[in-house]
Interface confidence: low
């Protein structure tokens, strides 16, 4: 840093004073010098460094009529909105005759009520769950001691006694307010008041109680909700996207979920109007007067297969001598699962019913025993899944084959010997 030389007497007749104040204060430092000849430009130093962008004004007053007479020069440095960065030692600096002269120092200090660098923030927490709050304040003057308050009640016996920048709260059972007081030699500043809203804990142990093709009954264990009773729980179900799109922690489903509300207790819900034999993901959240818990992770579940809801369609049955040809089409009604095949039953008047498993084919040729003179022969067909048989079709009478009718080529199915019936 520049320094004055002892070769000449200092031109300074007035040195900067001292300023001590609180943040935001506006003040002025002033120095005055008397010089002969052309007035020099006055610069300002802070802690030995030239302030290149100083907010300073310089006033020059001649003491005589000649330019070479003495001049009084006054430089004023304005400090607006005092900050910590403004503090330090201030001096005026002039260059006179190739010599540097520096005034005596003045000092700018920051001293006032504590200033918050960080204050507690509003947040939501699950009941009885630990969390931390932060508060940070500075002077000067230091030290700054913090005192935390919960619902306006101090958490320590005196400022500085107890946690300082970070308050660890082991858990709350009711919505509470927290603030911190910052104390120093000048007094006390109080932070904003943070509201910590206590929400229910995430429900646990979401599981299936029972399954039907179009409904699932699920149950869960509620989490703690503090002093606030749960008002309801909300269950969401979404079609699984072949395992894609919903990961364990994904916050939102890939499509609009089916949402149901459950009164509690009991913590159980029957979720209806589902598709049979379909994978879903489900999750649950519970709500108190303070708000909802977080959702559980998505739980993969699946509705079981059901039986087909309708019989095969367009059944036709024709007879030609000792053979009968039957064909049909897949049911139009929902299968509620994977079609495993068809069952066929035929029966004549006063004869026992014959039941056959046709598999997945949609036609069959029956080799009838006897001369084929049995009367009122009827055929019924049903589709089946792993869950069982769907409804049987209405009995279709076996019509005599007329010449000109197509006779499809197909595998002949020999009627089983037992049970069987024959015509005399």
């Amino acid at each position: 840093a520049p320094r004055g030389t002892q070769a000449e007497e200092s031109p300074f007749v007035g040195n900067p004073g001292n300023i001590t104040g609180a943040r935001g204060l506006t003040g002025t430092l002033r120095c005055q010098l008397q010089v002969q000849g052309e007035p020099p430009e006055v610069h300002w130093l802070r802690d030995g460094q030239i302030l290149e962008l100083a907010d300073s004004t310089q006033t020059q007053v001649p003491l005589g009529e000649d330019e070479q007479d003495d001049w009084i020069v006054v430089s004023q440095l304005r400090i607006t909105s005092l900050q910590l960065s403004d503090t330090g030692q201030y001096q005026c600096l002039v260059f006179l005759g190739h010599q540097t002269f520096v005034s005596q120092p003045g000092y700018v200090g920051l001293e006032g009520l504590p200033y918050f660098l960080e204050e507690p923030e509003d947040r939501t927490v699950a009941a009885n769950t630990p969390f931390n709050l932060s508060c940070q304040a500075q002077g000067p003057p230091e030290p700054v001691d913090l005192l935390w308050l919960q619902d306006a009640v101090p958490l320590a016996t005196a400022p500085g006694h107890g946690p300082q920048r970070s308050l660890h709260v082991p858990g709350l059972n009711k919505t509470s307010s927290f603030s911190c007081e910052a104390h120093n030699a000048k007094g006390v500043t109080t932070s904003r008041t943070a509201t910590i809203t206590v929400l229910p804990q995430q429900p646990r142990n979401l599981h299936l109680v029972s399954r039907q093709p179009t409904e699932l009954e699920v149950a869960w264990t509620p989490g703690l909700s503090g002093i606030y009773p749960l008002t309801h729980c909300t269950l969401q179900a979404v079609l699984s996207d072949d395992g894609m799109g919903i990961q364990a922690g994904e916050p939102d489903p890939p499509e609009e979920p089916l949402t149901s509300q459950a009164s509690v207790p009991p913590h159980q819900l029957r979720l209806g109007s589902l598709h049979p034999h379909t994978p879903y993901h489900i999750r649950v959240a519970c709500t108190s007067s303070q708000g909802p818990s977080s959702w559980t992770h998505w739980l993969p579940v699946e509705t079981p297969e059901g039986v087909p809801l309708g019989p095969p369609e367009n059944i036709s049955a024709t007879r030609n001598g000792s053979q009968a040809f039957v064909h049909w089409q897949e049911p139009r009604a929902p299968l509620q699962g994977t079609l495993l095949g068809y069952r066929l039953a035929y029966q004549g008047q006063d004869t026992p019913e014959v039941l056959m498993d046709i598999g997945l084919r949609q036609e069959v040729t029956l080799e009838l025993q006897g001369d084929g003179s049995v009367s009122n022969l009827t055929v019924c067909v049903a589709a089946y899944t792993a869950a069982g048989d769907g409804p049987w079709s209405l009995p279709v009478p076996l019509e005599a084959w007329r010449p000109g009718q197509a006779q499809p080529v197909h595998q002949l199915v020999k009627e089983p010997s037992t049970p069987a019936f024959s015509w005399p």
Epitope: P143, T157, G162, Q164
Partner: antibody, heavy 117, light 107 residues
Framework: EVNLVESGGGLVQPGGSLKLSCATS????????MYWVRQTPEKRLEWVAY????????YYPDTVKGRFTISRDNAKNTLYLQMSRLKSEDTAMYYC??????????WGQGTSVTVSS | DIVMTQSHKFMSTSVGDRVSITCKAS??????VAWYQQKPGQSPKLLIY???TRHTGVPDRFTGSGSGTDYTLTISSVQAEDLALYYC?????????FGSGTKLEIK
């Protein structure tokens, strides 16, 4: 994991001096007030000194006031205890400890100080 | 200075028993009381602060209670590993003072 490790203890003559150190890790040292506590050979625990998180406030009981000085270097995460004009009754295991609600939630393993001629 | 008195220097108990260790302050300390456990060859460990708040990781068989001048540390079902010295401390006013300790012995 919070860890406090004391060092600097040893045998010293009455009237002598000793400086204890406590190196810390696993937590933000500058956020916490710190303690020195000692345990006499008879297993009595005595509070020796404490210092505020910024180092601006220090407190001592009358038994050590004027002889012991607590200090800290937040840049080095280290706590110190400068002991001078030691007496035989200062013989003890010296522990540094972290303050939590003004209780000591973590302690070091201790360093032994013996004052004897 | 506030004096913390632990009247029992020794207490003998059996595994599974319930035991209560008491501490009396010479003046009201407004529940600013901590309890420490010191096992042989180890440094003290914090169990309870503010009279009844259990420190992180402390088994729930340890509970603290009391107000005014009388405070109690209760172990609901003593385990073999609970053999130790137990100290109370007031953190109400400087100088912070400790009780003289109660040694828990397992029969």
């Amino acid at each position: 994991e919070v860890n406090l490790v004391e060092s600097g203890g040893g045998l010293v003559q009455p009237g002598g001096s000793l400086k204890l150190s406590c190196a810390t890790s696993g937590f933000t040292f500058s956020d916490y007030y710190m303690y020195w506590v000692r345990q006499t050979p008879e297993k009595r625990l005595e509070w020796v000194a404490y210092i505020s998180n910024g180092g601006g406030s220090t407190y001592y009981p009358d038994t050590v006031k004027g002889r012991f000085t607590i200090s800290r270097d937040n840049a080095k995460n280290t706590l110190y205890l400068q002991m001078s004009r030691l007496k035989s009754e200062d013989t003890a295991m010296y522990y540094c400890a972290r303050l939590h609600f003004y209780a000591m939630d973590y302690w070091g393993q201790g360093t032994s100080v013996t004052v004897s001629s | 200075d506030i004096v913390m008195t632990q009247s029992h220097k020794f207490m003998s108990t059996s595994v599974g028993d319930r035991v209560s260790i008491t501490c009396k302050a010479s003046q009201d300390v407004s529940t600013a009381v901590a309890w420490y456990q010191q096992k042989p060859g180890q440094s003290p460990k914090l169990l309870i602060y503010w009279a009844s708040t259990r420190h992180t990781g402390v088994p729930d068989r340890f509970t603290g209670s009391g107000s005014g001048t009388d405070y109690t540390l209760t172990i609901s079902s003593v385990q073999a590993e609970d053999l130790a010295l137990y100290y109370c401390q007031q953190h109400y006013n400087t100088p912070f003072t400790f009780g003289s300790g109660t040694k828990l012995e397992i029969k």
